[in-house]
């Protein structure tokens, strides 16, 4: 987790002057309670935005937005501690706004933005906005969290994005995978355009399982420069194992902007329908 | 999450042997195609030995014959056995499984002419 380099910071608007800093997620009202706090955010929204760096790297950031509750608890609103926190990792990034100058109602609702956080290909973020100062230990709770999703590299918007293409979205293998006679699968795909070595994992399971029963890697080499986006065949020979019958096939390149770390291409071959064997019809009808 | 460990690398002199181990942590191995490549200085990772779920074999065409991959499954270790080691021989030695897409951290081999 990090924040978007690309410029200084800014959360004061018309009628508010507003600083953001950076935040340990641990805001002094935690140790020093107050006896007057704020209410919680209103509507709380997070949707994703896509914000180049200066350097002109194009990146996924949650864009947060909130408004104030239309009570008198705005008099006592210091700031928000924005916080994102990665599921998966458990690691945590807070900023702080700080209010300069006091709120004041007026014809319209506060509303607050932040779009600085940097966010994963396909990780799922609990976004936490927190009026400041925080509630006295037994007080009602001001704040409002959400949970964010973001998709992976194989949505329209992230593929462009530089994270996504550092890990090989824009190369499409356009995998074909056919039963061949005698227990083998032919695996058709299109190379890149770099010189570098490819894995393809056949993975097998039984009609309606989800354990592997066979297991197979090969290796393709390094191709040449004249073999570009051309089409790389390979024939794979599967385990005569009956009811071995689900085969999954993944492709994973070793591209020098993502190494052992590419996103894999996978394609699926379903076991094959077995006819439907009609009831036998009995040679005589019983009487009873 | 699976980890590898691999060990038992180190300089030797041309013409001699060396034994690598992958222990493999979080998963048994018995039923994975495992992998052994290597990345010499300045160069691509390349793959060295192959071995399936099934027990078959797969090498380099450069290795035949020099390079044995088997495991262990009651251990659950992937060896290496290198026999007639060149200079040319000389890299990081990893260990792959490409299902769970784990690698260790790699153990240096030398070979000195």
């Known amino acids: 987790l990090r924040l978007l380099d690309h410029r200084a910071l800014v959360c004061s608007q018309p009628g508010l002057n507003c600083t953001v800093k950076n935040s340990t997620c641990l805001d002094d009202s935690w140790i020093h309670p107050r006896n007057l706090t704020p209410s919680s955010p209103k509507d709380l929204q997070i949707q994703l935005h896509f914000a180049h760096t200066q350097q002109g790297d194009l990146f996924p950031v949650a864009h947060i937005e909130w408004t104030l509750q239309t009570d008198a608890s705005i008099l006592y609103l210091e700031g928000a501690e924005l916080s994102v926190l990665q599921l998966n990792t458990n690691e945590r990034l807070c900023v702080r706004f700080e209010f300069l100058s006091k709120l004041r109602h007026h014809h319209r609702r506060w509303r607050f933005t932040f779009s600085h956080f940097v966010v994963d290909p396909d990780q799922e973020y609990e976004v936490t906005v927190h009026h400041l100062p925080k509630p006295i230990p037994d007080g009602d709770p001001n704040h409002q969290s959400k949970n964010f999703l973001v998709p992976d590299c194989e949505h329209a918007r992230m593929k462009v994005t530089t994270p996504c293409m550092s890990s090989g979205s824009l190369w499409d293998p356009n995998i074909t995978v056919e039963t061949l006679e005698a227990h083998q699968l032919r695996v058709s795909f299109t190379l890149w355009n770099e010189s570098t070595h490819y894995q393809i994992l056949l993975t097998s399971f039984p009609h309606m399982e989800n354990h592997s029963c066979f297991e197979h890697m090969h290796h393709i080499p390094a191709p040449r420069p004249e073999e570009f986006h051309q089409r790389s065949n390979v024939t794979l020979t599967l385990r005569n194992l009956k009811g071995c019958c689900r085969h999954q096939v993944q492709i994973q390149p070793f591209f020098s902007s993502c190494l052992n770390d590419c996103l894999r291409h996978s394609a699926t071959v379903s076991c094959p329908e077995m006819p439907d064997t009609p009831e036998p019809i009995p040679d005589y009808m019983p009487l009873w | 999450e699976v980890q590898l460990v691999e060990s038992g690398g180190g300089l030797v002199q041309a013409g001699g042997s060396l034994r690598l181990s992958c222990a493999a942590s979080g998963s048994t191995i018995s039923d994975r195609a495992t992998a052994w490549y290597r990345q010499a200085p300045g160069k691509q990772r390349d793959m060295v030995a192959t071995?399936?779920?099934?027990?078959?074999?797969n090498y380099a065409d450069t290795l035949k014959g020099r390079f044995t991959i088997s495991r262990d499954n009651a251990k659950n270790i992937v060896y290496l056995q290198m026999n007639s080691l060149k200079p040319e021989d000389t890299a990081v030695y990893y260990c792959?499984?490409?299902?769970?897409?784990?690698w260790g951290q790699g153990t240096q081999v030398t070979v000195s002419s």
């Open positions: 792959n499984i490409p299902y769970f897409n784990s």
């Open positions: 071995m399936n779920s099934a027990g078959n074999t």
